[in-house]
Amino acid sequence: NKILVKQSPMLVAYDNAVNLSCKYSYNLFSREFRASLHKGLDSAVEVCVVYGNYSQQLQVYSKTGFNCDGKLGNESVTFYLQNLYVNQTDIYFCKIEVMYPPPYLDNEKSNGTIIHVKGKHLCPSPLFPGPSKP
């Protein structure tokens, strides 16, 4: 039995920040779970982890240097990524694991979300006229 995950196919991070919502076919509110976000086609980089236990506060952390926060809905986890770099444009996959009560459950691999990071564009400086000719 696998949990199904839905993600937006593509998101654009205009201000180097983005909200990525992972929607699950599963109620997480009465479970101990570990939701994570992975970068790359091979999911090699674990970007952010949200650890939840129905009776305690959410734990949100990144061991890979990403600036992230997380929010829990009853069937979703939203990852808020900030300070993204243009070169972190990639495909990102949501993963969910239900640790307790047993049995352990995880998800079918989702289609992922391409996050396109557009760097902050500085406002172009006004064009000054050249020096006046004598």
Partner: antibody, heavy 121, light 107 residues
């Protein structure tokens, strides 16, 4: 189809122990939690605890901690509930029930027929 | 531990009546609640899970509502086979306590 068949009625003396069995069929025994619930004569349902045959994970109600032991024999798909230091207040029908996970919502859709345990001197 | 307060403890009704049973918890359990029907000498039968979801095969005259701390089981038109005792049970952590039960008797 899913079936839980329990052992027969027992009469025990105060201070003794009783071991009730619950034989599962129609599904993979090690993949579902088994709950134990009891009902004293003319009273409501009382939750005793749950047991996961796949890993021996157990969760007992505080009231029964130290007196109840839930075990299993996977080779014969059977769960057991043993209650020790019996007293007259333990006279009840004891039920096993399978917990199903409805996409993260739990419930007990399958129940054994119940085992009457009478504690009397 | 979560306390389950079920009311009324008993009620008398006639065939065709609309019957409402309530279950209140002392803390938010979201929708993690089930309802059961039990007839004398029989094991309980699951009617509703996740507070509002009717189990397959259970007649549509049964319905569940509520979330958080207040829940209701409604029988829209009581039938002769519905005279029984009804229990709620929470699944928000352990112990998975039952309500005290509501006995539905013939008026």
């Amino acid at each position: 189809q899913v079936q839980l068949v329990q052992s027969g009625a027992e009469v025990k003396k105060p201070g003794a122990s009783v071991k009730v069995s619950c034989k599962a069929s129609g599904y993979t025994f090690t993949e579902y939690i088994i709950h134990w619930v009891r009902q004293a004569p003319g009273q409501g349902l009382e939750w005793m605890g749950w047991f996961y045959p796949g890993s021996n994970d157990i969760n007992y109600a505080q009231k029964f901690q130290g007196r109840v032991t839930m075990t299993r024999d996977t080779s014969i798909s059977t769960a057991y509930m043993e209650l020790s230091s019996l007293r007259s207040e333990d006279t009840a029908v004891y039920y096993c029930a399978r917990r199903d996970d409805f996409s993260g919502y739990d419930a007990l859709p399958y129940w054994g027929q119940g085992t009457l345990v009478t504690v009397s001197s | 531990d979560i306390q389950m307060t079920q009311s009324p403890s008993s009620l008398s009704a006639s065939v065709g009546d609309r019957v409402t049973i309530t279950c209140r918890t002392n803390e938010n359990i979201y929708s993690n609640l089930a309802w059961y029907q039990q007839k004398p000498g029989k094991a309980p039968k699951l009617l509703i899970y996740a507070a509002t979801h009717l189990v397959e095969g259970v007649p549509s005259r049964f319905s569940g509502s509520g979330s958080g701390t207040d829940f209701t089981l409604t029988i829209s038109s009581l039938q002769p086979e519905d005279f029984a005792t009804y229990y709620c049970q929470h699944f928000w952590g352990t112990p998975c306590t039952f309500g005290g039960g509501t006995k539905v008797e013939i008026k």
